[in-house]
Structure formats: structure tokens, C-alpha cells
């Protein structure tokens, strides 16, 4: 029975130019994570694999940076960046975990003015 | 428990169009991508596109975009994939599928029982 | 796009046996591949996804290994429900793409 739950970041934001950290945190779970996947809806990001360790995908070589943790680093932020960021717990025996990160790119005038994107 | 039930078989005339339904049932249609996969007679898969059902977001493979559209009614929770200026080469079977977990990786945990689509004069 | 090549169309084999069926990616892809099977007039069915792990309720005679461009799947006691045909896909990059796929006959 899969008993564990992802706690995420939920919803961030963080101004053009600048970094950002995704953060996933898997508990209430003794299963072993062999691997974190970091995606897009359509891309793969990083791989943190048990065995193998980090893979960035070569078209985020220069903007991503494995870590703090199992989390991701992304840097030289664009408004391109924003949208849905999921990360994937492969543990076991209990199967695949998932977690949403929502980021928001932010004009840097706008993030200096201490504006936060939320979804209701 | 998930299922993907498609419609019927097709046939057509080269340079019609088809429209090829999956209503789901079991779970919560928004919160999972709907993928369409097709495979010619004898041969093996090959990708089409996906929907989000939620947002009406698409991403198509671009061999297919200008020709292939995928939509998602919400209320009926079925997913459509239209296939327009059909050739003979459009002959195979069409699934539509649905990946493993609500934000997983592409993989394909679920899958329609596939429409055979014929396409000949 | 990512070209997922199954160089063996068939293979030959008898209950009991250890077949290895394999796939190679033009680039790669990290641990990104699944496996599916395939039996006449059925839909595919999910075996492996990320290279290694097992779908919910498939046995564990089939074992998915390989990273980078290179995997296997191994199936360690063949079964006569086994015989199928055996598909790789990468889930690394859009489009997605498919092994042209694997046929086991029976010897």
C-alpha cells in the first residue's frame, strides 16, 4: 500500500534573470527512492538516479544544476520558464510518487515590488 | 477501475477525414493526459499527440501537426483525435492511452482497445 | 527526434527459457525507456517504465536493465503466455518514439 505523500513548494516565483530551487520532499514512507525524475509535461529536466546519479538533459545543461538534495536548481531564468514543474519519486516497493511545483516568472521591476503569483 | 473504450471501426475515402472518440471512466478525466498512438498493419507504434483534458493544452508529434487534432469535451470526459487528408498510408489502428500517474512521466499505463481506421478508394 | 532501434524482428524460444530482448537509443536517454507487450489483436500492455521498474501486478520474471542508449529486457522463465510481440519506447523527449518491436516464437 503506497502510504507516503510528496510535499512540494507549491506555487513560486522568482524574477527573470535570477534562480530558482525545486524542492520535492517525499514522507510518511519507509520506501526506498531509487530515482527523481525532474519534468516538463513534455520534456525531462534531470534524472537523479540511486545508482547512476545526476543526468541533466542536454537542452538544460546550462541552466540547471543538480541540488540542494534530490531538488533542482534553475538559473538565468526567462518568462519562458514559467509554468508546471513535476517531480517524480521512484521508490520501492511502493510504486511512483509525483508532486507539482507551479513557477512564475516574474519582470524584475514587478518581483522587486514584492508581487506573488498564486493560484487560487 | 480506468477505462478507455473506443469507437468504432472506420472506413474512408483518401483526402477525408476521420474522428475517433475515447470516452474514459474511473478516474478524474481532468487531472490525466490523454495520448494517442497509432500502429500500421504489421508494424510497430507510433506517436500522434496528447491532450491535457483540463486545459485543452496539445502537443503534437510534427509529423502529424497541420493534419491531426486532438480535443477533449470535458462534460462526456472523451477524448477526439481528428485525422484529416487521409491516405492510404493513414491505414493502421488507432489507441488512445493514458499515462501511469496524474503528473507522471510518458509512459502508458492505460490503454483504449484501438479503432481500425481503413483507408481506400 | 529519438530513434529507438530493436535490431532482432524476431527471436526464437522455448518455455522455460531466458530470452533478452534489446534496444538501443541514438542518443541518450538516460533511464527513460519502457516496455510494453504486445499480443495479437490486444492493446500494448505496460511491462517496465525508467528503464528498471515493473509495472503494478507484472511478474517479476521480466526485468527491465540498460541506461544511456543501451536495454534489455530479460524475461527469466519463459511462458507459453509470454509469446508476444515486445516494444520499447523512450519517455525522454517529445515526440515520443518506439522500438519497431520484438516477436518471441516459439522454437
Known amino acids: 500500500m503506497m502510504t507516503g505523500t510528496i510535499e512540494t513548494t507549491g506555487n513560486i516565483s522568482a524574477e527573470k534573470g535570477g534562480s530558482i530551487i525545486l524542492q520535492c520532499h517525499l514522507s510518511s514512507t519507509t520506501a526506498q527512492v531509487t530515482q527523481v525524475n525532474w519534468e516538463q509535461q513534455d520534456q525531462l529536466l534531470a534524472i537523479c538516479n540511486a545508482d547512476l546519479g545526476w543526468h541533466i538533459s542536454p537542452s538544460f545543461k546550462d541552466r540547471v544544476a543538480p541540488g540542494p538534495g534530490l531538488g533542482l536548481t534553475l538559473q538565468s531564468l526567462t518568462v519562458n520558464d514559467t509554468g508546471e514543474y513535476f517531480c517524480i519519486y521512484h521508490t520501492y516497493p511502493d510504486g511512483t510518487y509525483t508532486g507539482r511545483i507551479f513557477l512564475e516568472v516574474l519582470e524584475s521591476s514587478v518581483a522587486e515590488h514584492g508581487a506573488r503569483f498564486q493560484i487560487p | 477501475q480506468v477505462q478507455l473504450v473506443q469507437s468504432g471501426a472506420e472506413v474512408k475515402k483518401p483526402g477525408a477525414s476521420v474522428k475517433v472518440s475515447c470516452k474514459a471512466s474511473?478516474?478524474?478525466?481532468?487531472?490525466?493526459?490523454i495520448e494517442w498512438v497509432r500502429q500500421a498493419p504489421g508494424q510497430g507504434l507510433e506517436w500522434i499527440g496528447v491532450?491535457?483534458?483540463?486545459?485543452?493544452?496539445?502537443n503534437y508529434n510534427e509529423k502529424f501537426k497541420g493534419r491531426a487534432t486532438i480535443t477533449a469535451d470535458k462534460s462526456t470526459s472523451t477524448a477526439y483525435m481528428e485525422l484529416s487528408s487521409l491516405r492510404s498510408e493513414d491505414t493502421a489502428v488507432y489507441f488512445c492511452?493514458?499515462?501511469?500517474?496524474?503528473?507522471?512521466?510518458?509512459?502508458?499505463?492505460?490503454w483504449g482497445q484501438g479503432t481500425t481506421v481503413t483507408v481506400s478508394s | 527526434d529519438i530513434v529507438m532501434t530493436q535490431s532482432q524482428r524476431f527471436m526464437s524460444t522455448t518455455v522455460g527459457d531466458r530470452v533478452s530482448i534489446t534496444c538501443k537509443a541514438s542518443?541518450?536517454?538516460?533511464?527513460?525507456v519502457a516496455w510494453y507487450q504486445q499480443k495479437p489483436g490486444q492493446s500494448p500492455k505496460l511491462l517496465i517504465y525508467?528503464?528498471?521498474n515493473r509495472y503494478t501486478g507484472v511478474p517479476d520474471r521480466f526485468t527491465g536493465s540498460g541506461s544511456g542508449t543501451d536495454f534489455t529486457l530479460t524475461i527469466s522463465n519463459m511462458q507459453s503466455e509470454d509469446l508476444a510481440d515486445f516494444f520499447c519506447?523512450?519517455?525522454?523527449?517529445?515526440?515520443?518514439?518506439f522500438g519497431g518491436g520484438t516477436k518471441l516464437e516459439i522454437k
Open positions: 492511452a493514458r499515462r501511469g500517474d496524474k503528473y507522471g512521466s510518458a509512459w502508458f499505463a492505460y
Open positions: 542518443q541518450d536517454v538516460s533511464t527513460a
Open positions: 519506447q523512450q519517455h525522454y523527449s517529445s515526440p515520443r518514439t
Open positions: 474511473g478516474y478524474a478525466f481532468t487531472n490525466y493526459l
Open positions: 525508467s528503464a528498471s
Open positions: 491532450i491535457n483534458p483540463g486545459s485543452g493544452g496539445t
